[in-house]
């Protein structure tokens, strides 16, 4: 018994049969398989698979496999039935399925694809027209993810300078790990002229906070004190602020990162709801002081790409000195 | 004046487990990440993981995963790293560091010695 | 994983000279999130420099920080007895391997 059940982990299993390989959503893509033919019977199952440049290989008990990717290129599974999990046992002869973008001539396709999710709330994409387009095409963009039942079309298409764009709302939902998921997007035309492009935005990334808005400066001895509202839609772990102090006699420019801050000084109105307060020492009352916050998102919630918020309207506070 | 206070030196034997504590003051404790970062015997610095006592979200190192536990108590204003099953290879001086959200480790606590030897 | 490759391992110079430490990273990094710190022997880290220049409270004004996307650098104009120790760079979970700054 032993001896037969050593031969057949060691014996090559039969190729796995029907792999077929099909699109979900936007940029889902599932092969799916039956088991060999004629497997040994004393054969426990597993199946071995790789993407074609032999990446992201995996070894698992099921007959399918799916991935997220942009469909703007080629993209192939080889896959081969085996007795164990052990990566060093030589698989059965490996079977590939590939799928191809949508056809259509590649300079047609728009080019720098990019979106980026406003304060939590809504997702701007901007793209440029490719080399091979007519001036006047009509492009549609295309989206979904997980928490929606089906694709949906963007209907606030924009322009600006060159760059098209169009927005969506998209709504960070409480509780849940919706940000461990992505955003597909695909931009084509109405007249289907040029070919799709596609990509895919993680939740974790390109995240803009909205500018925080400053809404007191008072001064206490030679200290400025500054309370201003944080965006909505944040945890505090999540966000750090910029807090800028230009001084008009002495030219001086002073930049304090901030944590958000608890208003518990005398000096802020206390308690408000969603502000956020700071002290700036040793600040001259006589002489004009402007201040603007800008907000970043800390990278160990969202991912490092180096979006701040746009600056707050500038606060002034103090008296220009005549310069006689 | 913030203030990161460790407790002390432990000497242990392989297999054994083992909590480490860190106890802050002067500063709001459920405002700022505690972070926990090891250094072998003349060897640099490794960032080992944070907890936010806030809502006690931890994000660990992918080497130190599921070899150490972060935990916080914000009543007493103390965060703890433990080991279930000490190894020869834990032995290392461990400081805990207060974290803002930027990232940079503002405060250092004395360091806990840990000897893990049999 | 980002990597911070800090250069030389070890600067040999004299008090009152010019010390420029290099901090290099795999890929480009957010300025805002780059930290320096000094070690002495015995002693925990300190934080010298944060968002890449920013000096942190109590940190002399011979120590300044600049740089940004993969390079960064310490530097620590005129060199006091007491600045000769271990200096390390550190982006949120990765630090750099550290230079020594010793006597001549």
């Known amino acids: 018994d032993y001896k037969d059940d050593d031969e057949s982990r060691t014996e090559t299993q039969p190729p796995v049969t029907n792999l077929s390989v099909s699109v979900e959503n936007l940029c889902t893509v599932i092969w799916t398989w039956n088991p060999p033919e004629g497997a040994s019977s004393n054969c426990s199952l597993w199946y071995f698979s790789h993407f074609g440049d032999k990446q992201d290989k995996k070894i698992a008990p099921e007959t399918r496999r799916s991935i997220e990717v942009p469909l703007n290129e080629r993209i192939c599974l080889q896959v081969g039935s085996q007795c164990s999990t052990n990566e060093s046992e030589k698989p059965s002869i490996l079977v590939e399925k590939c799928i191809s973008p949508p056809e259509g001539d590649p300079e047609s396709a728009v080019t720098e694809l990019q979106c980026i999710w406003h304060n939590l709330s809504y997702m701007k994409c901007s793209w440029l027209p490719g080399r091979n387009t007519s001036p006047d095409t009509n492009y549609t963009l295309y989206y979904w993810h997980r928490s929606l039942e089906k694709i949906h079309q963007c209907e606030n298409i924009f322009r600006e300078g060159q760059y098209f764009g169009c927005s969506f709302d998209l709504t960070k939902v409480k509780d849940s790990s919706f940000e461990q998921h992505s955003v597909q997007i695909m931009v084509k035309d109405n007249a289907g002229k040029i070919k799709p492009s596609f990509n895919i935005v993680p939740l974790t990334s390109r995240v803009k906070p909205d500018p925080p808005h400053i809404k007191n400066l008072s001064f206490h001895n030679d200290d400025l004190y500054v309370q201003w509202e944080n965006p909505q839609n944040f945890i505090s772990r999540c966000l750090f602020y910029e807090v800028e102090v230009n001084n008009s006699q002495t030219e001086t420019h002073n930049v304090f990162y901030v944590q958000e801050a608890k208003c518990e000084n005398p000096e802020f109105e206390r308690n408000v709801e969603n502000t956020s307060c700071f002290m700036v020492p040793g600040v001259l009352p006589d002489t004009l002081n402007t201040v603007r916050i800008r907000v970043k998102t800390n990278k160990l919630c969202y991912e490092d790409d180096k979006l701040w918020s746009n600056w707050s309207q500038e606060m002034s506070i103090g008296k220009k000195r005549n310069s006689t | 004046e913030v203030q990161l206070v460790q407790s002390g030196a432990e000497v242990k034997k392989p297999g054994e487990s083992l909590k480490i504590s860190c106890k802050g003051s002067?500063?709001?404790?459920?405002?700022?990440?505690i972070g926990w970062v090891r250094q072998m015997p003349g060897k640099g610095l490794e960032w080992m993981g944070v907890?936010?006592?806030?809502?006690?979200?931890?994000r660990y190192s992918p080497s130190f995963q599921g070899q150490v536990t972060i935990s916080a108590d914000k009543s007493i204003s103390t965060a703890y790293l433990q080991w279930s099953s000490l190894k020869a290879s834990d032995t290392a001086m461990y400081y805990c560091?207060?974290?803002?959200?930027?990232?940079?480790?503002?405060?250092w606590g004395q360091g806990t010695l840990v000897t893990v030897s049999s | 994983e980002i990597v911070l490759t800090q250069s030389p391992g070890t600067l040999s110079l004299s008090p009152g000279e010019r010390a420029t430490l290099s901090c290099r990273a795999s890929?480009?990094?957010?300025?805002?999130?780059l930290a320096w710190y000094q070690q002495k022997p015995g002693q925990a880290p300190r934080l010298l420099i944060y968002?890449?220049?920013s000096r942190a409270t109590g940190i002399p004004d011979r120590f300044s920080g600049s740089g940004s996307g993969t390079d960064f650098t310490l530097t620590i104009s005129r060199l006091e007895p007491e600045d000769f120790a271990v200096y390390y760079c550190?982006?949120?979970?990765?630090f750099g391997q550290g230079t020594k700054v010793e006597i001549k």
């Open positions: 550190q982006q949120y979970e990765t």
């Open positions: 890929q480009s990094i957010s300025s805002s999130y």
């Open positions: 968002g890449a220049s």
């Open positions: 002067g500063y709001s404790f459920t405002s700022y990440w």
């Open positions: 560091v207060r974290m803002p959200n930027w990232g940079s480790l503002d405060h």
């Open positions: 907890i936010y006592p806030g809502d006690s979200y931890t």
